[in-house]
């Protein structure tokens, strides 16, 4: 089943996906679509690349901000809304019959926490928090089941107040999601 990535309304969501061009620089087409990967191609394409660059984007909110030419095709969705929630398909279209790599990732968009943190605390959930929960772009991460999640005593330096972490943790536990932590 797909891993869940969390983003807060109004922030940027980051959905990791990558491949290793072989040989280096030999890029393959990639498509991102809304909905689980179908048998063929991508449904409801939000972004598509060819062998050189992004050549199709349904909205200016969708970006590949990683090193595209090294195979980092992670999708950034800017200024997310609740409607952006759902499963996304990253399809790496390796030439040949049925050679495509298909990756389903789930974006969970949450409403901003009601508690207003101190001005010094960073509240960019979507850049820092998803990568803390799901470090898909820098190698394997430890997997924790909801039952093993910490309750309140989760220390996140310069990031979130305890109440917000507590609230989010319980939301995740209630949803039964599998959380990956850095």
């Amino acid at each position: 089943s797909e891993v869940e990535y969390i983003a807060e309304v109004g922030q940027n969501a980051y959905l990791p996906c990558s491949y290793t061009p072989a040989p280096p620089g030999n890029l393959v087409p990639v498509c991102w679509g809304k909905g689980a990967c179908p048998v063929f191609d991508c449904s409801n394409v939000v972004l598509r690349t060819d062998n050189r660059d992004v050549n199709d984007r349904t909205s200016g909110r969708y970006w590949l901000k990683g090193d595209f030419h090294k195979g980092d095709v992670s999708l950034t969705i800017e200024n997310v809304t609740l409607a952006d929630s759902g499963v996304y398909c990253c399809r790496i279209q390796i030439p040949g019959i049925m050679n495509d790599e298909k990756h389903n990732v789930k974006l969970v968009v949450i409403k901003p926490a009601k508690v207003t943190p101190a001005p010094t605390l960073q509240r960019d959930l979507t850049s820092a928090f998803p990568r803390m929960l799901t470090t898909g772009e820098h190698g394997p991460a430890e997997t924790q089941t909801p039952g093993s999640l910490p309750d309140v005593n989760l220390t996140v330096s310069n990031f979130f107040c305890e109440l917000q972490i507590f609230t989010l943790t319980n939301e995740l536990r209630d949803s039964g999601a599998t959380i990956r932590t850095a």
Epitope: G35, A36, P38, F40, D41, G96
Partner: antibody, heavy 116, light 107 residues
């Protein structure tokens, strides 16, 4: 208006060949996957084959693999289904449809009857 | 392959009433499911894709729901032109497969 028109169906003996054509209009043909779906008389629908934009990849249901060949011609806005070594169980109305996963729209269909 | 099972095979409903058609997949297809309507002697017409998205030009009385293995097509208030055969189709797993169809007839 998007339109698909099939032709080429008819009566053929077992082991024979037939080439179906589908002429497309009203959309940018080269931007879409195209598919063939068939329906045996009084039966349900069966996906047969499809071809990727540009023709770089073609896919077939197992029952026709090695016997049927799908092809496309962007200059003529047409997709074809070459059917060889036809069997009685290939008897069906053959529909041309736009799309790879779901199909919209469909042509009116052309009947292929394989019988001696 | 993924077997799609539709029920009932025949559904008799009066005009103006609600019709509920079911489709079950033998394995998960996420929301990669479409519904088609086919009238006698005509080609199928796409009604719903992605389990719940109405195709262009399809009236609002048609709605789809479900995900995973259980799906439903609902026609809220049957019109005379809605009596036909309805097929579900999955496009999540190889190969693409259709259900055997549900015939919706006038009661």
């Amino acid at each position: 208006e998007v339109q698909l028109v099939e032709s080429g169906g008819g009566l053929v003996q077992p082991g024979g060949s037939l080439r179906l054509s589908c002429a497309a209009s009203g959309f940018t043909f080269s931007s879409y996957w195209m598919s063939w779906v068939r329906q045996a008389p009084g039966k349900g629908l069966e996906w047969v084959a499809n071809i990727k934009r540009g023709g770089s990849e073609r896919y077939y249901v197992d029952s026709v693999k090695g016997r049927f060949t799908i092809s496309g011609d962007n200059a003529k806005n047409s997709v074809y289904l070459q059917m060889n070594s036809l069997r009685a169980e290939d008897t069906a109305v053959y529909y041309c449809a736009r799309g790879s996963n779901w199909f919209d729209p469909w042509g009116q269909g052309t009947l292929v009857t394989v019988s001696s | 392959e993924t077997v799609m099972t539709q029920s009932p095979a025949i559904l008799s409903v009066s005009p103006g009433e609600r019709a509920t058609l079911s489709c079950r997949a033998s394995q998960s297809v996420y929301s990669n499911l479409a519904w088609y309507q086919q009238k006698l002697g005509q080609a199928p017409r796409l009604l719903i894709y992605d389990a719940s998205t109405r195709a262009t030009g399809i009236p609002a009385r048609f709605s789809g729901s479900g995900s995973g293995t259980e799906f439903t097509l609902t026609i809220s208030s049957l019109q005379s032109e809605d009596f036909a055969v309805y097929y579900c189709q999955q496009y999540n797993n190889w190969p693409i497969t259709f259900g055997q169809g549900t015939r919706l007839e006038i009661k």
